[in-house]
Amino acid sequence: MKVLQEPTCVSDYMSISTCEWKMNGPTNCSTELRLLYQLVFLLSEAHTCIPENNGGAGCVCHLLMDDVVSADNYTLDLWAGQQLLWKGSFKPSEHVKPRAPGNLTVHTNVSDTLLLTWSNPYPPDNYLYNHLTYAVNIWSENDPADFRIYNVTYLEPSLRIAASTLKSGISYRARVRAWAQCYNTTWSEWSPSTKWHNSYREPFEQH
C-alpha cells in the first residue's frame, strides 16, 4: 500500500481542516488508514482522524482543531496499521479556504432596488470576521448568457443593485462566496442559491 498523491490540506481558520490524498489503488480509507495530527506545541498530544473514502482510491479526513492562530503548525502522520506511509506538516494560516456565507436573502420591497444580504460565516472573535470580502453571482434561469458577478470589497455583507439592471418579469438566482486577502485564501464554496422573480415598474416614456 502506497500514497500516490500526498495529502493536501485546507483550513476554515476556525475549527476544521480538511486533508485529501490518493492511494495507489482502491482503499477502504476508514478501516485501513489513520491520519495522526499534532500541534507543534510543548506538551500537546496527537489526535487521530479516521478518513472517509472520496472516490475509489481517494481519502478525505476532517481534522478537528480548537481554534486557529497564525503561528499554528501541525505534524501529520499517515498510518496503515503499524506502517508509516507518509509524514508531513501543515500550517493552517497558509492554506485557508473560508467557510461559505449563509442565509442569503433577496429583499425586493425597497422601491426599485434589490437588496441582497447574507451572513458572515465567522463569529466576531475570529480574525477572518473583519477581513472577508465577497463575490455575488446573479444569473437568469431562462438565459444562460445572463450571468454576472458583483465584487463586494467592503465589509458589510450586503449588496444593493437597481432592479432595472436585470430583466423584468423573469426569475433570477443568486449565490455568494467569500475570500480574505490578508491570508491570500482561496475562495469559499458558493452559498446555497436563492431565487426571486424580478419585476419593476418601467419608467413612463415621455412623448
Epitope: F41, L42, V69
Partner: antibody
Framework: EVQLLESGGGLVQPGGSLRLSCAAS????????MHWVRQAPGKGLEYVSG????????YYANSVKGRFTISRDNPKNTLFLQMSSLRAEDTAVYYC?????????????WGQGTTVTVSS | EIVLTQSPGTLSLSPGERATLSCRAS???????LAWYQQKPGQAPRLLIY???RRATGIPDRFSGSGSGTDFTLTISRLEPEDFAVYYC?????????FGQGTKLEIK
C-alpha cells in the same frame, strides 16, 4: 467554579524534599496540560515544569531538571510536584497552572500558590 | 533558549493615559505563542492576552496585543486605576516556556 488549590509547601532544609499537590475542581483535569510556575520573593515569574494531558510527556526547566518530578492523577483530579535536593534558590511561591490549548500556552487558571522556604 | 526582555522596567503614568509595554525576543518566534499577564501584589497572575493579540475571557477591550517576529507590544489604551500592576510577557513554544522579567506600571 474552576479552581486550583495548592498544598504541601513549608519550611525545609537544604538537600531536603517536599511534595506539592494541586487539587483541581470545576473542570476535568485530563483535558489539559498542567504546569508549575514559581516566583521567588520580590522577583518575577519562572517556569518550572509541565505535563501533558494524559501524563505521557513531561518538561522541566534546566534549573530543576533531575531534581523535580511532575506527575498527575487524572481520576483524582490532582497534580503533583515532587521536589528533592532542594536549594536556597528554590525558595518561592509555587503556582499550579492550567493551559488551555485554545489559549495556545496562555495560562488561564492559576492557583493561589503555596510557599516553599528552603533554609537551614 | 529564547530570552524575553521587557522594557521599560518601570513605567510611570497617570490614569487616562495610554500605556505601551514592550517585549523583545532574542530570536524570531514564528511558530510560538506570546501571552501577557497582569499581577497585583499578593495575587496570582491573570491572563490578559494570548496568541499575541487575542484577549482572554473577561478582559476589557482597552487591553490589546500586537507584534510579530521578535517585537511584541501590550497596549492599554486608557489607564484605569486598577490597571497599575506588574505585567509579564510569556513565550510558549514547541520546546520551552519563558517569561520576561516584568514591567511595573505605577501611578505617576
Amino acid at each position: 467554579e474552576v479552581q486550583l488549590l495548592e498544598s504541601g509547601g513549608g519550611l525545609v532544609q537544604p538537600g531536603g524534599s517536599l511534595r506539592l499537590s494541586c487539587a483541581a475542581s470545576g473542570f476535568t483535569l485530563s483535558s489539559y496540560a498542567m504546569h508549575w510556575v514559581r516566583q521567588a520573593p520580590g522577583k518575577g515569574l519562572e517556569y518550572v515544569s509541565g505535563i501533558s494531558p494524559s501524563g505521557v510527556s513531561t518538561y522541566y526547566a534546566n534549573s530543576v531538571k533531575g531534581r523535580f518530578t511532575i506527575s498527575r492523577d487524572n481520576p483524582k483530579n490532582t497534580l503533583f510536584l515532587q521536589m528533592s535536593s532542594l536549594r536556597a534558590e528554590d525558595t518561592a511561591v509555587y503556582y499550579c497552572v492550567r493551559v488551555k490549548v485554545k489559549y495556545r500556552g496562555g495560562m488561564d487558571v492559576w492557583g493561589q500558590g503555596t510557599t516553599v522556604t528552603v533554609s537551614s | 533558549e529564547i530570552v524575553l526582555t521587557q522594557s521599560p522596567g518601570t513605567l510611570s503614568l497617570s490614569p487616562g493615559e495610554r500605556a505601551t509595554l514592550s517585549c523583545r525576543a532574542s530570536q524570531g518566534i514564528s511558530s510560538a505563542y506570546l501571552a501577557w499577564y497582569q499581577q497585583k501584589p499578593g495575587q496570582a497572575p491573570r491572563l490578559l492576552i494570548y496568541g499575541t493579540s487575542r484577549r482572554a475571557t473577561g478582559i476589557p477591550d482597552r487591553f490589546s496585543g500586537s507584534g510579530s517576529g521578535t517585537d511584541f507590544t501590550l497596549t492599554i489604551s486608557r489607564l484605569e486605576p486598577e490597571d497599575f500592576a506588574v505585567y509579564y510577557c510569556q513565550l510558549y513554544g514547541a520546546t520551552s516556556v519563558t517569561f520576561g522579567q516584568g514591567t511595573k506600571l505605577e501611578i505617576k
